[in-house]
């Protein structure tokens, strides 16, 4: 058992059939001595007396609010929250796995540029009694400074029959320099809770693995005379890292017909311009990726050709 | 990225072609050796990363653009000194700055290809003949070397009279690409910053 | 005590169906995940299938993904296994299990695929 | 498809010490517990080792686990009649958990 925060307390149990449980000695916060009972939740059977209690839980009927009273006052107050352990591994209900960049992905992490602030997000299916709390830092042993926010709904989807919500958390490593090269990863770890039910999941990245930039801004089509050719030109995303010279990034030019079926050109340019053919109906697109680094491509910034 | 690629002319900056391509060699080398090495720990957020030119070079804080000076954090140690005379600096007017910039840059390449040239003799003596290093990136980081053109001490390739343990060699080899290609990564960008200046 | 009686084992044609069942007792069932696994005769052991203990996800063996559902009724106390388009290598005792560090097995019951 | 592997047979005669390699990777064994099973004939398999060195209650203490990097072994010290049965070893995979991934399964023989 271990505290997770005032007067909230986690119980890991090996979680399966008949198991024995852990025994928990739960003790009131009172200089009282005499006259003490105790009793579960919202019920007011009495499940002992005296300054401490001991019970042995096995089950999320054994969690829960337990209260201490004397004379018809509460004196204190101990939640017990139960964490799974399933075969040596931790219950993993509350959140979604969402598979990318690949299985028991639960958490997804995502910057637009090297200035140490980046966006995590999961997804559950369970749209009550649930909170999260989030922490991070860069490396374990030795951690240094990140700063997050409150986790917040971000999104809800209809995913079949089901209701989907997205929760998503900013943070922002308190001393980033953005040209650093990263030898300690961040961590970060949201605890999640349920009704009476605890867990933990965690994610460990460099920056440079998870940029992804904005789209190019100022997507522009200028016409190229006597010709089907045009010229496309755009600009670096505002939030792209500064100076661009030494953060710079490589693009690719893309024009679809208005068909998915028909074929796209494609041109890779490290340029903010480049000459291709419009074809009637077709739409000419623009994305961004970091040109020394292999990190994620941008969404695509979109003009029609005509 | 195997794609076609419109690069633009390196012109006025020697050193700007050569990065290019050292950072093609090592990313290259580096896929080889995850993909050879599949039952080895060689993955990014397997291995430690470890800096072989910590407290030794510091190519990032000496080549930080000028616009991240401002920036408390990129300034925690500038004060390392080297030699000042290479010829990436031949047709322009360079400031020190700049001159330690590359010439800490060479220190790292130097530093890099003895590693690597070491680690190579190794494992040319393993039974398995598994992996080796890729001739094209050793021959890459000399061209580089070359452009950038500081005298400096030689540093004589070490020798070690006992028998390899091939398996920790190729988690060495792993983890030195890792960090080479960051390194490598740094490069590329303070030459094309250099170039645009 | 915890006991897992298992039924619906039989012998079947090449690509018909077959439902086989797994009563829980003794325990609360719709607290635990479960597993299929099966054994052809003279060989090994083979996981099949995976439920979470609120039926909420599940999982499957390439070999029967898109033939076999797993799916249970927590008010019923039972776990179930639909075979369809079954195929002579889908010969086996199947057993089914409770998910967790100590587990318990069910007696096993004899599938046999054959025309 | 089995990761996992596992002699097919080890013998050994009554109270010698006889030990079941079980080799797996890193993304199974390297990351997870392992189980040992033994089955006899015509019955369900039966625990005997559980997060990679610990006997169920019941288990005779002639068994015991213990896991290595990505290998496990399971060792009956003093082998006995009784223990001539079919034994198993079992993880997972940390990217298809909760899939089980079972070994090739190893015939112990007790001779004379």
């Known amino acids: 058992i271990w505290e997770l925060k005032k007067d909230v307390y986690v119980v890991e149990l090996d979680w399966y059939p008949d198991a024995p449980g852990e025994m928990v000695v739960l003790t009131c916060d009172t200089p009282e001595e005499d006259g003490i009972t105790w009793t579960l939740d919202q019920s007011s059977e009495v499940l002992g007396s005296g300054k401490t209690l001991t019970i042995q839980v096995k089950e999320f009927g054994d969690a829960g609010q337990y209260t201490c009273h004397k004379g018809g006052e509460v004196l204190s107050h101990s939640l017990l929250l139960l964490h799974k352990k399933e075969d040596g591994i931790w219950s993993t209900d509350i959140l979604k796995d969402q598979k990318e960049p690949k299985n028991k992905t639960f958490l997804r992490c995502e910057a637009k540029n090297y200035s140490g602030r980046f966006t995590c997000w999961w997804l559950t299916t369970i749209s009550t009694d649930l909170t999260f709390s989030v922490k991070s830092s860069r490396g374990s042993s030795d951690p240094q400074g990140v700063t997050c926010g409150a986790a917040t709904l971000s999104a809800e989807r209809v995913r079949g029959d089901n209701k989907e919500y997205e929760y998503s958390v900013e943070c922002q490593e308190d001393s980033a320099c953005p040209a650093a090269e990263e030898s300690l990863p961040i961590e970060v770890m949201v605890d999640a809770v349920h009704k009476l039910k605890y867990e933990n999941y965690t994610s460990s990245f460099f920056i440079r693995d998870i940029i992804k930039p904005d789209p190019p801004k100022n997507l522009q089509l200028k016409p190229l005379k006597n010709s089907r050719q045009v010229e496309v030109s755009w600009e670096y995303p505002d939030t792209w890292s500064t100076p661009h010279s030494y953060f710079s990034l490589t693009f690719c030019v893309q024009v679809q017909g208005k068909s998915k079926r028909e074929k796209k050109d494609r041109v890779f340019t490290d340029k903010t311009s480049a000459t291709v053919i419009c074809r009637k109906n077709a739409s000419i697109s623009v994305r961004a990726q970091d040109r020394y680094y292999s990190s994620s491509w941008s969404e695509w910034a979109s003009v029609p050709c005509s | 990225r195997n794609l076609p690629v419109a690069t633009p002319d390196p012109g006025m900056f020697p050193c700007l072609h050569h990065s290019q391509n050292l950072l093609r060699a090592v990313s290259n080398m580096l896929q080889k050796a995850r993909q050879t090495l599949e039952f080895y720990p060689c993955t990014s957020e397997e291995i430690d990363h470890e800096d072989i030119t910590k407290d030794k070079t510091s190519t990032v804080e000496a080549c930080l653009p000028l616009e991240l000076t401002k920036n408390e954090s990129c300034l925690n140690s500038r004060e390392t000194s080297f030699i000042t005379n290479g010829s990436c600096l031949a047709s322009r007017k360079t400031s020190f700055m700049m001159a330690l910039c590359l010439s800490s840059i060479y220190e790292d390449l130097k530093m890099y290809q003895v590693e690597f040239k070491t680690m190579n003799a190794k494992l040319l003596m393993d039974p398995k003949r598994q992996i080796f290093l890729d001739q094209n990136m050793l021959a890459v980081i000399d061209e580089l070397m070359q452009a950038l053109n500081f005298n400096s001490e030689t540093v004589p390739q070490k020798s070690s009279l006992e028998e390899p343990d091939f398996y920790k060699t190729k988690i060495k080899l792993c983890i030195l690409l890792h960090a080479f290609r960051i390194r490598a990564v740094t490069i590329d960008r303070v030459m094309s910053y250099l170039n645009a200046s | 005590q915890v006991q897992l009686v298992q039924s619906g084992g039989g012998v079947v044609q090449p690509g018909r169906s077959l439902r086989l069942s797994c009563a829980a007792s003794?325990?609360?069932?719709?607290?635990?995940?479960m597993h299929w696994v099966r054994q052809a005769p003279g060989k090994g052991l083979e996981w099949v299938a995976f439920i979470r203990y609120d039926g909420s996800n599940k999982y499957y063996a390439d070999s029967v993904k898109g033939r076999f559902t797993i799916s249970r009724d927590n008010s019923k106390n039972t776990l179930y296994l639909q075979m369809k388009s079954l195929r002579a290598e889908d010969t086996a005792v199947y057993y089914c299990k409770t998910h967790g560090s100590h587990d318990n097995w069910g007696q096993g019951t004899m599938v046999t695929v054959s025309s | 498809s089995y990761v996992l592997t596992q002699p097919p047979s080890v013998s050994g005669t009554p109270g010698q010490r006889v030990t079941i390699s079980c080799s797996g990777g890193r993304s199974n064994i390297g990351s997870n517990t392992v189980k040992w099973y033994q089955q006899l004939p015509g019955t369900a398999p039966k625990l005997l080792i559980y997060?990679?060195?610990t006997r169920p209650s019941g288990v005779p203490d002639r068994f015991s686990g213990s896991k290595s990097g990505t290998s496990a072994s399971l060792a009956i010290t003093g082998v006995q009649a009784e223990d001539e049965a079919d034994y198993y070893c079992?993880?997972?995979?940390?990217?298809?958990?909760?899939?089980?991934?079972f070994g090739t399964g190893t015939k112990v023989t007790v001779l004379g």
């Open positions: 997060g990679n060195d």
């Open positions: 003794g325990f609360t069932f719709s607290s635990y995940g």
């Open positions: 079992q993880s997972y995979d940390r990217g298809t958990h909760p899939a089980l991934l």
